[in-house]
């Protein structure tokens, strides 16, 4: 069972002094979101008993193993159900405390009732303040039963629950009709999942015979020991004022465990600490009684005296629960109450005994849960004891359970049961996870879900190149940290597997499933430099670069050109996918923009060093195209062009450019400037007769604009061959010749 105790301080004169403390003896308990699981939770459960809202309760954590609830302002704040949750995973356990108001109309004779499946449970509510009206019993907040007030027996209202089953478990209350629920008697009924003395699926297994009021857990057969007792069967008393599964906790305050209620995991429930009784656990046990709630009787023999915390204290020469055994009777000494081994190991178990006559090797035997008896292989005889050593055959899961060491001599016999837990070494259920990779290293997360038992003591990472027959490389790592595999080969697949271990001999589990992790390519090391660049238009740029000459093959798949537009905060990336390329045309750029330009070699997904940057200013874009361009032949060597100014100009036009080309001709076109921007007509002279020409034009502001539509026109016939076209413009509005 989980080592979890909920303590309630019942010194109730002042509710503000009331507190609840939850203490965990579990390894790593309450450490929060670390590898070992969730923290301790302590809260009031308002689902069944609702009290008037008040200021919120204060929760204080005292280290990792303890949490305390304070801040109760009035007695009604205390009434109801409180719960503490601790332990991780499948071991997560809820411990419940039910608080009754000392001034209630009805009070429970006993708050916690633990019964076996099929038993009859009897809940008894004692009349504290009489009301001559019906009593309503509720189960988990819902109506259950009614009693007429005449049905009280000796000032008590009894609820009989025959043949109880586990679903009958829960919070029961007895309330006078039309009285405040805070005046109710609240009970907790715990129904074990098995009949008396049995546990396990199908209730086929026998309980170990828990002593001193311990209760056998119906799931795992362990004894949940009352506060103040320890051992597999609760056979050992703790020192006064101590509690916890190993007596490791100490009651706070100078009066020890007085005034404290202890609640433990089901099926134990709650009780006073050892040596105390009463509704507020403030009364010491009467002579001859001891233990939690003083429920146990000493009945000491042979001059033993009764200690209210531990039971019979025997005079020398006697031992046993009632001092009924003579020291001549052999006695098993210092047997651990619980041992843990890993599956398929062959452990050695020691069992020591003393007595008169002295036990010898053959008089000590070891009995397994299935009844098999093992004889010792050797014995060490010392003046005060004999220690027999047993070599246990290879352990299987069925060996889990209660083993027994037995000593028999002519003076009598003694036996001691102890629990053996056979644990399954952990086996990863998944492959490790790749976090990041480089050319020569892989960063791996090794901790994965696993089957079998924890805790994980070590994690081994095994790795080797894929399809290799070489030995595996192994690295031992911390379970909670990521691992870097170093000195690997670039661009290589590695098979990686995890192996988990738990403490103890044979705790190494089988290797987990493999996963393939591939290192990255080698990083390209060469730094290109920009040879030059030139603008091929307002939005086009040709760039060329070089690489240093080095021996051996070039490590790279291509180049990445980057253009940074600082004004707009935008980056343009151009991929050149040939490592042989040394030039590239960048198009679709933004005219009039100042760019920073660099180039890098890349290989796979890795980038080499960038070239020193260059700063390039693209010319701004020109104006829109002139409109309605029209050509009209005037003679055998002249054609007149007319047009309209472009619309939505970004500024004043500096000139027009006319392009003249012979239709179907193979030569370069001729560009002629019209230097007076106000012109809307010009005459192109010096043309050949009877020749078909193509014309188009564009305007210029700071840069050249878009071309207009192309127009065709033929000169008139039979003139002389001209020297070449020239131009005469006319300002339509002024009528000037040029």
């Amino acid at each position: 069972a989980v080592d979890l105790t909920l303590l309630a301080n019942l010194r109730l004169t002042d509710p503000q002094r009331f507190f609840l403390t939850c203490v965990s003896g579990e390894a790593g308990a309450g450490r929060g979101s670390d590898a070992w699981g969730p923290p301790l939770l302590l809260e009031k459960d308002d689902r069944i008993v609702r009290t008037p809202p008040g200021p919120p309760l204060r929760l204080a954590r005292n280290g990792s193993h303890q949490v305390t609830l304070r801040g109760f302002s009035k007695p009604s704040d205390l009434v109801g159900v409180f719960s503490c949750v601790g332990g991780a995973g499948a071991r997560r356990t809820r411990v419940i405390y039910v608080h009754n108001s000392p001034g209630a109309h009805l009070l429970p004779d006993k708050v916690t009732h633990t019964v076996n499946k099929g038993d009859t449970a009897v809940l008894s509510a004692r009349v504290h303040k009489e009301k001559q009206t019906d009593v309503i019993w509720k189960s988990n907040g819902s109506y259950f039963y009614t009693l007429d007030w005449h049905e009280a027996q000796d000032g008590r209202f009894l609820l009989q629950l025959p043949n109880v089953q586990p679903p009958s478990s829960g919070i029961y209350s007895a309330t006078y009709l039309e009285a405040s629920p805070l005046g109710s008697a609240f009970f907790r009924l715990i129904v074990r999942g098995c009949g008396a003395g049995r546990w396990g699926p199908g209730c086929t297994k026998e309980c170990p015979g828990c002593l001193h009021g311990g209760v056998c857990h119906d799931h795992d057969g362990e004894c949940v020991c009352p506060p103040g007792f320890t051992g597999t069967r609760c056979e050992q008393a703790c020192r006064e004022g101590r509690f916890g599964q190993s007596c490791q906790e100490q009651c706070p305050g100078i009066s020890g465990c007085r005034g404290l209620t202890f609640c433990l995991p089901d099926p134990y429930g709650c009780s006073c600490g050892s040596g105390w009784r009463g509704s507020q656990c403030q009364e010491a046990c009467a002579p001859g009684h001891f233990g939690a709630d003083c429920r146990l009787q000493c009945q000491c023999q042979n001059g033993g005296t009764c200690d209210r915390f531990s039971g019979c204290v025997c005079p020398s020469g006697w031992h046993g629960v009632h001092c009924e055994k003579s020291d001549r009777i052999p006695q098993i000494l210092n047997m651990a109450s619980e041992l843990e081994f890993n599956l398929e190991t062959m452990p050695r178990i020691n069992c020591a005994a003393a007595g008169n006559p002295f036990p010898v090797r053959g008089s000590i035997e070891l009995r397994k849960p299935d009844g098999t008896v093992l004889l010792s292989t050797k014995a060490i005889v010392e003046p005060e004891k004999t220690t027999a050593e047993f070599e246990v055959p290879r352990l299987v899961l069925a060996d889990s359970g209660f083993w027994e060491c037995r000593v028999s001599t002519s003076g009598g016999q003694d036996s001691r049961r102890f629990k053996v837990n056979v644990k399954v070494p952990p086996v990863p259920l998944a492959a490790p996870r790749l976090l990041t990779k480089q050319s020569r290293q892989l960063v791996v997360s090794p901790l994965v879900s696993f089957s079998g038992d924890g805790p994980i003591s070590t994690v081994r990472l095994h790795y080797r190149p894929q399809d290799s027959t070489m030995d595996w490389s192994t690295i031992v790592v911390d379970p909670s940290e990521n691992v870097t595999l170093m000195n690997l080969r670039p661009k290589t697949g590695y098979s990686v597997r995890v192996q988990l271990s738990r403490p103890g001999e044979g705790g190494e589990g089988a290797w987990g499933p493999p996963t393939l992790m591939t290192t990255d390519c080698p990083e390209p090391l060469l730094q290109p430099w920009l040879e030059g660049w030139h603008v091929e238009g307002t939005d086009r740029l040709r760039v060329s670069w070089s690489l240093p000459l080095v021996p051996g093959p070039l490590v790279g798949d291509g180049f990445l050109l980057r253009l940074w537009d600082g004004t707009r905060g935008q980056e343009r990336r151009e991929n050149v996918s040939s490592p042989q390329a040394r030039t590239a045309l960048l198009t679709g750029l933004t005219p009039g923009t100042h760019y920073q330009l660099d180039v890098q070699l890349y290989h796979c997904t890795l980038l080499g060093p960038a070239s020193p940057p260059a700063h390039v200013l693209l010319p701004p874009s020109g104006p829109p195209a002139p409109r309605h361009l029209h050509a009209q032949a005037l003679s055998d060597s002249e054609i007149q062009l007319t047009w309209k100014h472009p619309e939505a100009l970004p500024g004043p036009i500096s000139k027009y450019v006319v392009e003249v080309q012979v239709a179907g001709g193979a030569g370069d076109p001729l560009w002629i400037d019209v230097d007076r921007p106000e012109e809307t007509s010009t005459i192109i002279r010096g043309l050949n007769a009877s020749t078909r020409y193509l014309f188009r034009m564009r305007a210029s502001i700071q840069g050249l604009g878009d071309w207009s539509n192309t127009v065709e026109e033929s000169t008139l016939g039979n003139g002389l061959q001209a020297e070449g076209p020239v131009q005469e413009s006319r300002a339509a509005e002024e009528g000037l010749d040029q």
Partner: antibody, heavy 121, light 109 residues
Framework: EVQLLESGGGLVQPGGSLRLSCAAS????????MVWVRQAPGKGLEWVSS????????YYADSVKGRFTISRDNSKNTLYLQMNSLRAEDTAVYYC??????????????WGQGTLVTVSS | QSVLTQPHSVSASPGKTVTISCTRS????????VQWYQQRPGSVPTTVIY?????PSGVPDRFSGSIDSSSNSAFLSISGLKTEDEADYYC???????????FGGGTKL
């Protein structure tokens, strides 16, 4: 589903006897207090008698005390009303009802359809 | 034994709010919880309010109950009246001394 079904009503002469039954289903009958309530033609509701879950304690309206007896058989999930020395003013529809407890008060949460008792010569 | 007195009938128009009173003749109205039942013509009674002011599930929030100690009365209010609300309404309380379940005379709405 909770169901209450009355039977045993009919015509009876003054001074005569009649036994009403109420068969219950759909809930743990042995845990609930049960009552008989009647309603004379064109009149209001009148509580007649109640019986506690154990059957050990019973209560009656003054108008029927000494003449009517309420009982229950928890093994058969049945409630009874034995009516003796019947009078004309006992003519009514007789309902059996279950008492439930919302918070800490009781109220009649399920009613049968009723059975008519007519006392007439 | 105390008596619970209700008006014989009340009437109101659809959509309006109506309040039915239930006055206790002796003893404090607040010392016992009051329940209200609705009985439509030809039907069995059903609970609309229990414990003075609590509604069973399924009862619309147009129905509300209250207690007024100064007039020693309990009240049932129905807002947004619908024709389906036309019925007899009974108040009821418990006499803890005699163990009697006491009904009011009923109010026809």
């Amino acid at each position: 589903e909770v169901q209450l079904l009355e039977s045993g009503g009919g015509l009876v002469q003054p001074g005569g006897s009649l036994r009403l039954s109420c068969a219950a289903s759909g809930f743990t009958f042995s845990h609930y207090m049960m009552v008989w309530v009647r309603q004379a033609p064109g009149k209001g509701l009148e509580w007649v008698s109640s019986i506690y879950p154990s059957g050990g304690w019973t209560y009656y309206a003054d108008s029927v005390k000494g003449r009517f007896t309420i009982s229950r058989d928890n093994s058969k999930n049945t409630l009874y009303l034995q009516m003796n020395s019947l009078r004309a003013e006992d003519t009514a529809v007789y309902y059996c009802a279950r008492l439930d407890y919302g918070g800490n008060s009781a109220y009649f949460d399920y009613w049968g359809q009723g059975t008519l008792v007519t006392v007439s010569s | 034994q105390s008596v619970l007195t209700q008006p014989h009938s009340v009437s109101a128009s659809p959509g309006k709010t109506v309040t039915i009173s239930c006055t206790r003749s002796s003893g404090n109205i607040a010392s016992n919880f009051v329940q209200w039942y609705q009985q439509r013509p030809g039907s069995v009674p059903t609970t609309v309010i229990y414990e003075d002011d609590r509604r069973p599930s399924g009862v619309p929030d147009r129905f509300s109950g209250s207690i007024d100690s100064s007039s020693n009365s309990a009240f049932l209010s129905i807002s947004g009246l619908k024709t389906e609300d036309e019925a007899d309404y009974y108040c009821q309380s418990h006499d803890r001394t005699t163990r009697a379940w006491v009904f009011g005379g009923g109010t026809k709405l």
